[in-house]
């Protein structure tokens, strides 16, 4: 997250970190069910661990943390690397979470976002770009949903209805390491961090997010079929 600020503790209990050994964060994710996460499809890896209820990026033990293995990864059938359409994936955890103030699912919005909607994006991704500098704790950033026209103008021929753009002033954006993390609008999950320009936070080049309102049926049916 570029030019965000430290999230208040306990305010993002659905935020998950996907980790490679040894404790290497590579993507964010979102708890949407007691045993299921949503993340970006491009975050798919064979072996990874899931950390929930953790505030700092470092692997130091926190009393609220819960660690899991991902036992099943189900990318959306419409996703095709290296494209960015349909960029979402469900991850089944090896067990159900223990609900606490630090670990709690969020509902996926069935309403599509309208331009001007105020949202919050969060993650442990780099806070500088193209340099790499990681934060000590989870970062939060207020962003506004942009019209689809502004989105398409920013990225000609690259935008479809499975995506929406959101941003703020130049210099504020999600970035590498934030993929799969939540965009929360009006208390529900509206999007996932997906892609954007490189370096991040360039003027008139907003972040692009997976438009989850288009996928509520697939999410529900996939969880039911695999529970």
């Amino acid at each position: 997250i570029i030019n965000g600020s430290d999230c208040d503790m306990h305010t993002q209990p659905w935020q998950a970190a996907l980790l490679l050994r040894p404790n290497q964060l590579y993507c964010g994710a979102v708890l949407v069910h007691p045993q299921w996460l949503l993340t970006a499809a491009h975050c798919r890896k064979k072996v990874f661990r899931v950390r929930l209820g953790h505030y700092s990026l470092s692997p130091v033990y926190e009393s609220g943390q819960q660690m899991f293995q991902g036992v099943k990864s189900i990318p959306h059938p419409g996703y095709s690397h290296p494209g960015h359409s349909n960029d979402l994936m469900l991850i089944k955890l090896n067990r159900r979470i223990r609900p606490t103030k630090d670990v709690r699912p969020i509902n996926v919005s069935s309403h599509c976002p309208s331009a001007g909607t105020k949202c919050l994006v969060s993650g442990w991704g780099t806070t500088k770009s193209p340099q790499v500098h990681f934060p000590k704790v989870l970062q939060c950033l207020n962003i506004s949903v942009l019209s689809q026209k502004r989105c398409e103008d920013a990225y000609p021929r690259q935008i479809d209805d499975t995506m929406f753009c959101a941003g703020d002033k130049a210099g504020r954006d999600s970035c590498q390491g934030d993929s799969g993390g939540p965009v929360v609008c009006n208390g529900s999950l509206q999007g996932l961090v997906s892609w954007g320009d490189y370096p991040c936070a360039r003027p008139n080049r907003p972040g692009v997010y997976t438009n989850l309102c288009k996928f509520t049926k697939w999410i529900q049916e996939t969880i039911q079929a695999n529970s």
């Epitope: 590579y26 970006a40 590498q176 934030d178 799969g180 961090v193 997906s194 320009d197 972040g207």
Partner: antibody
């Protein structure tokens, strides 16, 4: 078949110019970042330049900054390297290479260069 | 810039030998290291990415390990086709930098 084919190398005098081309086939070129890497005779690999998929980010090795220009034409599936003010130390085999890392995607995961051309030889000599 | 230091610069080995090549970065690069193999007159070939992930089609006798600043490429049982030069490369930070190379020669 995924393939990269370089062309445009040759013998040029110091101070001269040359334009290298790299023709891509067998993959969706516009989705990938690209690099130029060179290898002087009997020496190791030296990264020269990088260009992102949409050309929004470009970078160069200090040794060529201000003299070389990387560009691409996604409609033509082509990568270019314009080399000006050439010096004897630019003599090398020049490779174009596909970058597996998609820096538009916002994961923190880096791969390497998975597809390389056969190389084109540039000789700078009087 | 991040300096990549490879050792040894050359190694003589026989078919069936276990060969280990090391690469050290001048600053931490997490797991973001690639290994390449290059044969004379040919382009480099990606063997390993993210320090330990085997590129598709690469034989399992090749393995990589390490994180931070110290990395290792191991060939568990050297085959005739493995005699070549091997390079490491750090990939997260521009400018990309390669190690100086390790030539694996026939003893």
């Amino acid at each position: 078949e995924v393939q990269l084919v370089e062309s445009g190398g040759g013998l040029v005098q110091p101070g001269g110019s040359l334009r290298l081309s790299c023709a891509a086939s067998g993959f969706t070129f516009e989705h990938y970042s690209m690099n130029w890497v060179r290898q002087a005779p009997g020496k190791g690999l030296e990264w020269v330049s990088y260009i992102s998929s949409s050309s929004s980010y470009i970078d160069y090795a200090d040794s060529v900054k201000g003299r070389f220009t990387i560009s691409r034409d996604n409609a033509k599936n082509s990568l270019y390297l314009q080399m000006n003010s050439l010096r004897a130390e630019d003599t090398a085999v020049y490779y174009c290479a596909r970058d597996l890392t998609d820096r538009q995607s916002r994961d923190y995961y880096y791969y390497g260069m998975d597809v390389w051309g056969q190389g084109t030889t540039v000789t700078v000599s009087s | 810039d991040i300096q990549m230091t490879q050792s040894p610069s050359s190694v003589s080995a026989s078919v069936g030998d276990r060969v280990t090549i090391t690469c050290r970065a001048s600053q931490g690069i997490s797991s973001w290291l690639a290994w390449y193999q290059q044969k004379p007159g040919k382009a480099p070939k990606l063997l390993i990415y993210a320090a330990s992930s085997l590129q598709s089609g690469v034989p399992s006798r090749f393995s990589g390990s390490g994180s931070g600043t110290d990395f290792t490429l191991t060939i568990s049982s050297l085959q005739p086709e493995d005699f070549a030069t091997y390079y490491c490369q750090q990939v997260p930070i521009f400018p990309y930098t390669f190690g100086g190379g390790t030539k694996v020669e026939i003893k």
